[in-house]
């Protein structure tokens, strides 16, 4: 039985050329987190954090994606094309798979505030 919940940074905005932290947090379960996948809006994999093998960043993103903090992901040198949905997928044992969604809006404005709040999707 899946008892856990995924909390995410929800809807966030950041300015073009800047960076942003995508963060998910799994709570209310004792399950092992064996792997976390980070996917982009087109469902292409950005990164994998495997308990045994550590962090692996997809080569196409290695210059703009940094692992962490924690199980989160940092996107750097943001472009307007980075606007869209991002998904964290927590593979756990014995619970199974938990999935969280974050919507990132990249703004042209230099005064865009990076607002991040934790919410349950």
């Amino acid at each position: 039985m899946m008892t856990g919940t995924i909390e995410t940074t929800g809807n966030i905005s950041a300015k073009k050329g800047g960076s942003v932290i995508l963060q998910c947090h799994l709570s209310s379960t004792m399950a092992q987190v064996t792997q976390v996948n980070w996917e982009q809006h087109d469902h292409s994999l950005l990164a994998i954090r495997n308990a045994e093998l550590g962090w692996h960043i997809y080569p196409a993103f290695k210059d703009r994606v940094a692992p962490g903090p924690g199980l989160g992901l940092t996107l750097q040198s943001l472009t307007m094309n980075d606007t869209g949905e991002y998904f964290c997928t927590y593979h756990t044992y014995p619970d199974g798979t938990y999935r969280g969604r974050i919507f990132l809006e990249v703004l042209e404005s230099s005064v865009a505030e990076h607002s991040a709040r934790f919410q349950i999707p």
Epitope: Q32, T34, Q35, N37, L45, I48, N50, A51, E52, L53, G54, H56, I57, Y58, P59, H91, T92, Y93, P94, G96, T97
Partner: antibody, heavy 122, light 107 residues
Amino acid sequence: QVQLVQSGAEVKKPGSSVKVSCKASGGTFSSYAISWVRQAPGQGLEWMGGIIPIFGTANYAQKFQGRVTITADESTSTAYMELSSLRSEDTAVYYCARLHLGSSAYYGMDVWGQGTTVTVSS
Amino acid sequence: DIQMTQSPSSLSASVGDRVTITCRASQSISSYLNWYQQKPGKAPKLLIYAASSLQSGVPSRFSGSGSGTDFTLTISSLQPEDFATYYCQQRYVFPPTFGGGTKVEIK
């Protein structure tokens, strides 16, 4: 049933390099990673590094960093481990092992190659 | 790196005996622990994953327990084919590390 078939035994001179292959038969690399583990004569198991073939990226144990290179060819379902600057202490049996990714990542190394003996001697 | 310490390093037992092998981690690894069996000249074989889950095809006389830092592999009734070396391995933190092994010999 997936099997991992490794290349044959090697005898190498100190200072040289060795490249060991590991071919998956009866399956593909798409949802797996490959780890390399070595075992010196009469000693225990030592993890060297691992690769996620769909990414082509590898991570290494600090002890082997800079001296080991792990690669994979998805088209032939073959992984490779190259160890350079060989010394006598590198004499060991080298194993490749399959690791599940994704929803089955809780398994350990559940399929192993038969092992490749590498002897380093002048 | 997390250090894994197994005890005893070797033991002698008879067929039918109950055998217990312990593994201690240098820091908490939750239940991210696997047990492997290795026979001379052969590759290791996965017995137990996630500290207590039996790998498919492994006889039920093998069981694993523990969490945190202390773990146990138990063979309830030793069979002739069980004489081998057993290794624990943590997969909680990169890089994965193995215990030094426990050799189970015939008394």
